[in-house]
Interface confidence: low
Amino acid sequence: HTAAQDNCTCPTNKMTVCSPDGPGGRCQCRALGSGMAVDCSTLTSKCLLLKARMSAPKNARTLVRPSEHALVDNDGLYDPDCDPEGRFKARQCNQTSVCWCVNSVGVRRTDKGDLSLRCDELVRTHHILIDLRHRPTAGAFNHSDLDAELRRLFRERYRLHPKFVAAVHYEQPTIQIELRQNTSQKAAGDVDIGDAAYYFERDIKGESLFQGRGGLDLRVRGEPLQVERTLIYYLDEIPPKFSMKRLT
C-alpha cells in the first residue's frame, strides 16, 4: 500500500502531500520539496526528508572509540540534490557554486571545492555509531533490558532488520548503538541504516517524522530513557578524503 487508505495520509512521513490520485483512486503521497512519490509503508530516504525540511517554513524545523575516519555531521542542514530513487547525489553544491562530495547519509566527506570538483561514486556509509548520554536515573539501566528495548525500537519503529543492529554498549550514562550494513548485505526492501539513524535522531530530538504517532516513549523496565545528548559518527566503506589542513 502507498498510504493509509482511510484518510489518505502517510504514516511514515508527515512531510508529504497526499491525495487519492494514484492508480484506481488509491492514495498517493509526495514528499514536500521534491514532489517525489514516496512509499508510505517504509521510511522515506534521508535525502528527501532533508529536502522537505528545507522547503518547509523555518519555524517547523564497553564503549567503542570512533575510528580516525569517522565523520560527524558538522555542516548541519542543507538543501540536497537527490537522485531519482531518493538517494543523495554524490556531489552536492550550494547556490554559490561551492561543491563537495557526500556519503550515502549525506555527510560531507571531502574538502569543499568549486564546480570542477568530481565525485565519482556515492560512497556507502556502512557503520554508524550513535552515541547517547541519558539523563540521571535512580540507578543504572539493566544492560540486557536496555539492549533488548533499543533493538526492539529499531526493529519495530524503524523497521530495520535486526541483523543490522550490530551491538548496544552501555557504560552509565553513555549508550552506544552500532548499526552495520555493507552494500552486499542490503537486500531490496531493506531499510537503510542511514535512514533509520536519521529517524531515530529526529525522534530523540522530539521532532518525530511519523504522522500522528506519539513521540518516542522509550522505557526500560518502566523507567523512562531520556536522552540529553546525541552524537552520531559515520564510517564509510572508503575513508574520506580531507586535506591535512582540516585534520590539524
Partner: antibody
C-alpha cells in the same frame, strides 16, 4: 480478517508433512505469523514465527527440526520432517510474533490436526 | 525465558473471583498476554502488555504485574468463563523454551 491452516492428516512415524497457513483480509507485510501446537489434552506449545522481514525465530526445541517459510504474499508454511508420535497435535497459526508489535497473537486460525501413527 | 503458571486447576462459584499467576524465569518488561481457550476452539486473546484489554473483552478481566510476576484476575465469574487460561511472554524471542505457561483450568460451579 482470517487465517486458515491446511495440510494436516495422518502420517506414519518418520514421515514428513508440510502445513500451510493462508491469510486473508489484512496486509501480510505488516504482521509476523506464528505457529503454535497443542497435543490432545495438553497445553499450548510455541513453535516459532516469521517476522515482517522474512526473518525466522524458533523455540529452542524446534530449531533444526521444523522449518517455517514465507512462501507467498498470503501463505506461510511449516515443514515437519522425521515426525514422531509425540508430534501428534493440533497445529495453529496466529497473527503476531514475539518481540514484535504488542507481542501477542491477536488472530488465530481454527487449527489443523496432525496425527502421527503407524 | 520460561513461564510457570499457577494453579493448574481452580474451582470457583458463579459470581466469585479467581486469580491466576504467571511467573517468568527473567524480566519480560510487561510483554505478557493472557488467552482464554475453550475445548475444540483456538485461544482467544484477553489481555496484552500485561494490563491492556483486547478488543471486545469485558472489564471483569484484569491483568497486572511487572518484571517477572503477573496476575490475571476474573471477577463476577460467569458460567461462560469456564475455560483454560494461558499466559504468554512476548519479550524473549531467540532463546525461548515455550512462550506459554502451562495453563490453568477454571471450573465454574
Amino acid at each position: 480478517q482470517s487465517l486458515e491452516e491446511s495440510g494436516g492428516g495422518l502420517v506414519k512415524p518418520g514421515g514428513t508433512l508440510t502445513l500451510t497457513c493462508t491469510v486473508s483480509g489484512f496486509d501480510f507485510s505488516n504482521y509476523a505469523v506464528t505457529w503454535v501446537r497443542q497435543a490432545p489434552g495438553e497445553g499450548l506449545e510455541y513453535i516459532g514465527f516469521v517476522g515482517i522481514y522474512g526473518d525466522f525465530y524458533y523455540a529452542n526445541w524446534a530449531k533444526g527440526r521444523f522449518t517455517i517459510s514465507k512462501t507467498s504474499s498470503t501463505t506461510v508454511t511449516l515443514q515437519m520432517p522425521s515426525l514422531t508420535v509425540a508430534d501428534t497435535a493440533t497445529y495453529f497459526c496466529a497473527r503476531g510474533g514475539l518481540w514484535t508489535g504488542n507481542s501477542y497473537f491477536d488472530l488465530w486460525g481454527p487449527g489443523t490436526l496432525v496425527t502421527v501413527s503407524s | 525465558y520460561d513461564m510457570t503458571q499457577t494453579p493448574a486447576s481452580v474451582e470457583v462459584a458463579v459470581g466469585g473471583t479467581v486469580t491466576i499467576n504467571c511467573q517468568a524465569s527473567e524480566s519480560i518488561n510487561r510483554y505478557l498476554a493472557w488467552y482464554q481457550q475453550k475445548r475444540g476452539q483456538p485461544p482467544k486473546p484477553l489481555i496484552y502488555r500485561a494490563a491492556t484489554l483486547a478488543s471486545g473483552v469485558p472489564s471483569r478481566f484484569k491483568g497486572s504485574g511487572s518484571g517477572t510476576e503477573y496476575t490475571l484476575t476474573i471477577s463476577d465469574l460467569e458460567c461462560a468463563d469456564a475455560a483454560t487460561y494461558y499466559c504468554q511472554q512476548g519479550y524473549g524471542y531467540s532463546t525461548v523454551g515455550n512462550a506459554f505457561g502451562g495453563g490453568t483450568e477454571v471450573v465454574v460451579k
